[in-house]
Interface confidence: medium
């Protein structure tokens, strides 16, 4: 059928809760393309009816909720004008009994995020929740060893749990919980996180450093193509995500229909004690509406922006 096969990593997931996977493979998905999801090489696409428990939502496949029998290989086919790519995603579903003491607490499955807190420092854990725009996530609650976390050392900020003055006792099994609302129905999402403590100080602690951009403006002509790199250094053991946002929304989501502005594929260079990450933002065609808008590069708790501005008129031409 002329499609190029791309095999993604296995995902090990929890039954009885929502799950979503976005079919993006920049730069393939950065142009005008159609995306269709299939299960186990079926010729029949996954339903696009939002009432279906499993359905395609734009480029996402959405399970509301995931069930044990949903295990299998799913394919998303990305068709462009001159290309076709088939991305294979292997989903394995497990029954999880988060706080059943007879099973010994949180199971050690590979979908649990392994995160690190730095001893004696102020640090944070991140609840990774990836869902399409049609899913509304409520406030996040955090648990340690199945007890809700309370205390002045802990602060919930958006998707993060801030931990001040990390101690050795902070290691252990955590979970973050959120209520997801979709088409009037509510579902519980619960992610397990195994937390270890390290004494190693990275450069300047565990906060990523954005080298570029530096909160500045860039002069660019209307209608031109522009690519801007975000360069970030971070410790090798970091769990931070790096991305570009506009109006507090991922650029790939914000420009989901036009795909005029896209985030590129992240690359990194490994140094002896840290990594240098680069993720770019591409403006296929700069439009008037882009000027004056802060495009934010996020790296964990760090942010930096660029603002596009029209070049000053060159009066020498008159």
């Amino acid at each position: 059928d002329g499609c190029k096969d791309i095999f993604m990593k296995n995902e090990i997931l929890s039954a009885s809760q929502p799950f979503a996977f976005n079919c993006t493979f920049p730069p393939i998905t950065s142009g005008e393309v159609s995306v269709t999801w299939y299960k186990n090489s079926s010729k029949i696409p996954v339903s696009k009816i939002i009432q279906s428990r499993i359905h395609q939502d734009e480029t996402w496949i959405l399970f509301l909720p995931m069930e044990w029998g949903d295990s299998g290989v799913y394919q998303c086919v990305i068709k462009g004008r001159d290309s076709c790519h088939r991305i294979h995603v292997n989903l394995t579903v497990f029954e999880k009994h988060w706080c059943d003491t007879s099973i010994g607490g949180l199971p050690n499955l590979s979908d649990e995020y392994k995160q690190i807190l730095h001893l004696g420092k102020d640090d944070s854990l991140t609840c990774h929740l990836h869902f399409p725009k049609s899913c509304v996530l409520g406030p996040i609650k955090w648990y340690k060893d199945c007890n809700e976390i309370k205390g002045e050392r802990f602060t919930v900020l958006e998707t993060r749990l801030l931990v001040s003055n990390v101690s050795a006792e902070d290691r252990g099994n955590y979970a973050c919980q959120a209520i997801l609302t979709h088409s009037g129905k509510q579902y519980e999402v619960l992610n397990g996180i195994t937390v270890s403590i390290t004494e190693r100080a990275g450069y300047g602690g565990s906060v990523p450093k954005i080298i570029y951009p530096k909160n500045h403006s860039i002069e660019v002509q209307l209608g031109t193509t522009l690519i801007v790199d975000c360069n970030v250094t971070d410790t090798k053991d970091n769990t931070n995500l790096r991305c570009w946002r506009v109006n507090n929304t991922l650029v790939d989501d914000y420009y989901d229909e036009s795909k005029r502005i896209r985030e590129g594929v992240e690359t990194h260079v490994s140094f002896r004690e840290h990594n240098l990450y680069t993720v770019n933002i591409t403006f296929l065609e700069v439009k008037m509406e882009d000027y004056g808008l802060p495009f934010m590069c996020h790296a964990g708790v760090s942010t930096a922006y660029i603002i596009l501005q029209l070049p000053a008129p060159d009066f020498r031409a008159y």
């Epitope: 190693r200 100080a201 990275g202 450069y203 300047g204 450093k209 080298i211 360069n231 250094t233 260079v269 490994s270 140094f271 002896r272 004690e273 240098l276």
Partner: antibody, heavy 127, light 107 residues
């Protein structure tokens, strides 16, 4: 100019201890990683230990061959580097060099290399 | 631990000729490789860092190349003072490891 001068070498019996010192001058000592490198007679170079700079929290690394026996330390007020060597073995016999690591970290650019070496001090472990 | 292998162990070349020394890493070390020259009774001297950058005061006849696992030190026209032992060092990860050295001798 940059100068590194080792001292403290000598003859010691197996199982004994020795403390090497390195006096540094001509550069901002706290800004640099510092290493000990050794070279057994007629053999090649072997990295022994490293202590990182102030910005990196003075973290320490050792070669497996010396871990648990050698201790690297620095006195920034005196611009001095030390290597405390305990439970010495015959295979520790070598010239020990105090070496500055040119690692520069400004958040982006890093140049890893050993740019200045002392003349070395000979440690002989023999009964 | 990353193992560094230098070849050849000994290289015999006439003055004025070109010399090529190789260093291979057992795994990817990007460009974090440096070259050192050591003469008898002296401490080693840094000649090249970050695979291809000449250290201050090193003659332009020396050049370094390579990335990943294969690296080369080239001396375009050998002078009498260039005959020595040359070591490569990887700085990609701990422990730092040296090659066993290449002895460059007069033919």
């Amino acid at each position: 100019q940059v100068q590194l001068q080792e001292s403290g070498g000598g003859l010691v019996k197996p199982g004994g201890s020795l403390r090497l010192s390195c006096a540094a001058s001509g550069f901002a000592f706290t800004d640099y990683y510092m290493n000990w490198i050794r070279q057994a007679p007629g053999k090649g170079l072997e990295w022994v230990s490293l202590i990182r700079n102030k910005a990196a929290g003075y973290t320490i690394y050792y070669a497996d061959s010396v871990k648990g026996r050698f201790t690297i330390s620095r006195d920034n007020a005196k611009s001095s580097l030390y290597l405390q060597m305990n439970s010495l073995r015959a295979e520790d016999t070598a010239v020990y060099y105090c070496v500055r690591d040119m690692t520069i970290y400004d958040g982006y650019y890093v140049d890893y290399a050993l740019d200045y070496w002392g003349q070395g001090t000979l440690v002989t472990v023999s009964s | 631990e990353i193992v560094m292998t230098q070849s050849p162990a000994t290289l015999s070349v006439s003055p004025g000729e070109r010399a090529t020394l190789s260093c291979r890493a057992s795994q990817n070390i990007n460009i974090w490789l440096s070259w050192y020259q050591q003469k008898p009774g002296q401490a080693p001297r840094l000649f090249i860092y970050k695979a291809s950058n000449l250290h201050t005061g090193v003659p332009a006849r020396f050049s370094g190349s390579g990335s990943g696992t294969e690296f080369t030190l080239t001396i375009s026209s050998l002078q009498s003072e260039d005959f020595a032992v040359y070591y490569c060092l990887q700085s990609q990860s701990y422990p730092l490891t040296f090659g066993q050295g290449t002895k460059l001798e007069i033919k």
